[in-house]
Amino acid sequence: QPPPPPPDATCHQVRSFFQRLQPGLKWVPETPVPGSDLQVCLPKGPTCCSRKMEEKYQLTARLNMEQLLQSASMELKFLIIQNAAVFQEAFEIVVRHAKNYTNAMFKNNYPSLTPQAFEFVGEFFTDVSLYILGSDINVDDMVNELFDSLFPVIYTQLMNPGLPDSALDINECLRGARRDLKVFGNFPKLIMTQVSKSLQVTRIFLQALNLGIEVINTTDHLKFSKDCGRMLTRMWYCSYCQGLMMVKPCGGYCNVVMQGCMAGVVEIDKYWREYILSLEELVNGMYRIYDMENVLLGLFSTIHDSIQYVQKNAGKLTTTIGKLCAHSQQRQYRSAYYPEDLFIDKKVLKVAHVEHEETLSSRRRELIQKLKSFISFYSALPGYICSHSPVAENDTLCWNGQELVERYSQKAARNGMKNQFNLHELKMKGPEPVVSQIIDKLKHINQLLRTMSMPKGRVLDKNLDEEGFESGDCGDDEDECIGGSGDGMIKVKNQLRFLAELAYDLDVDDAPGNSQQATPKDNEISTFHNLGNVHSPLK
């Protein structure tokens, strides 16, 4: 064991180092002093530290620790923040395209309905966006409102075009008649099921990502306790009091200290692991009716089918509504020609053929793979921080908190620390209140993720027809339908590529009376590409 510096030695080196921490030298003794007032760097002989210096070291140690923690989580934080933003934007783009397809369907097939239909469709998709972002809207109510609003217009414009304008007075009765007579058949129920399942999953996916950010932010900004500050000071700075400026802490000692300081944070580990695995399970189930992209982009077709259903039953319906809403029937129902098959302007759905294919679903899977590389993030934190702060290689000739040692022995170090500081006590205190809160939030989201009514594997496919979700098979396994009947069916392979490379972004909102031609928005396309290949240090 090297002897303490001789009493006549100056504290010159310590002074110059401390000067960098705290300009002004009034706290540093000229020569070593007994240091009887020290509480952390308890001297075995004369020391170059004062009580004020010790306090400054503690403050610096805690700040260092916070910075180390922030740099440790920077990559993970960036990964989740960026993906949360990308997916939110992607979902909004899907909603906008779905709205535009639906408006295009009305414009091309039912021009007499367009002004009002655009309004109702717009309100519906606004509600869809709000729901995804967490608004307290009921999906069934949204769908009911859409069909309740559409029916009076269909009735007065399509089924009874000769009715006087005053017939709009019976709107309220027609809205109700829509449900009483089930005028759209089972289509509203079908849409409710598909939209609610897909949006619920989408919403919880975004919720989970945002909670991930909150977890990282919480642990990122943890304030370390005074006890931890003392331990860190003893590890990083007490050697300076003995003039040992170049000595590094022992690696094993660093691990012990970090585990003590991070005992509360490490408790998140179990719930963090479960969070990533539950999120993976959710993502694996996001296809077919659980994939909002697939469902929303096919809505225009289902709505078209529902209007055709009304038209096929128009004669009978007009008679019954005459009774229910008591308007005088001046004319027999006469159906104008309406095409059987869905007509969609080919300009709208021109798909570019490209080599590179990236979809929302592949993007989700990619995110999960990256997140899985951070599955041990919290349990690995103490080791990570030690490996990113100066420690002695191989635990030889290193500082153990009290003295320079040839080889670090955990037992000896613990014994030596017993009277100064109880590590066990620190662990027993339990996590900080903020950590407890974030653990509760993780438990909650994990439960939500687990209880989502998601299909297990590909079992869902067998049940589709029983539940009436999809009629007819769309061929290849990886293809999804967004089409209705006959030749009007459009097959879409990998929807997001299809979205990103739409040759025309039909935005009916922007130009209700024009030919609806618009070029794709470059920023929308780029949104879905290149997050960069982030590699995790905490594998």
Epitope: S166, D169, C173, D180, K323, L324, C325, A326, S328
Partner: antibody, heavy 117, light 108 residues
Framework: QVQLVQSGAEVKKPGASVKVSCKAS????????ISWVRQTPGQGLEWMGW????????NYAQKLQGRVTMTTDTSTSTAYMELSSLRSEDTAVYYC??????????WGQGTLVTVSS | QPVLTQPPSVSVAPGKTARITCGGN??????VHWYQQKPGQAPVLVIY???DRPSGIPERFSGSNSGNTATLTISRVEAGDEADYYC???????????FGTGTKVTVL
Amino acid sequence: QVQLVQSGAEVKKPGASVKVSCKASGYTFTSYGISWVRQTPGQGLEWMGWISAYNGNTNYAQKLQGRVTMTTDTSTSTAYMELSSLRSEDTAVYYCARKGSSQFDQWGQGTLVTVSS
Amino acid sequence: QPVLTQPPSVSVAPGKTARITCGGNNIGSKSVHWYQQKPGQAPVLVIYYDSDRPSGIPERFSGSNSGNTATLTISRVEAGDEADYYCQVWDSSSDHYVFGTGTKVTVL
């Protein structure tokens, strides 16, 4: 807010007629129908019929056909129900109710009609 | 004209759940509405179109309808829920509006 205010209680002799009024406010009168429902003491609800405020079309319950007449005055947003040839079993509280499609979403406070010799 | 059958009475302890049924042939194919009537007052619509709640009606009230039975469910029952409850449908074949026999809910 939507309100339906009915006329006051009536006491009638058997064979006489009674006319109950129902004044609507707080909504577009012609956009809804007005239905009439009665409730005999200690008994359930019985639908009597309805009238479209939009065009005056009526639909009466079979058992009251010929004895009941429903009318509206759109200028005052008022509906009327007249029941003739009263008998003791017509003693009841008579309600007017705003008719949506097949549901009655707002009700008047009720009018007690007592038929007694 | 359909007959809608309801149990004459249902008793329930406060905080518990009350279920009132309305039976009718293939009632699931019709829209069912429910009314609450407190003594000396006019009926109030509490559920329409099987399961929708008008504004102002607490979430504790819910409805369902399938097969031959429609059900009104009152969860976390309160003393103020004590009333008569009626179901109602529109019969398209006779073009008549039919009320159920009524159920008296007593809160113990």
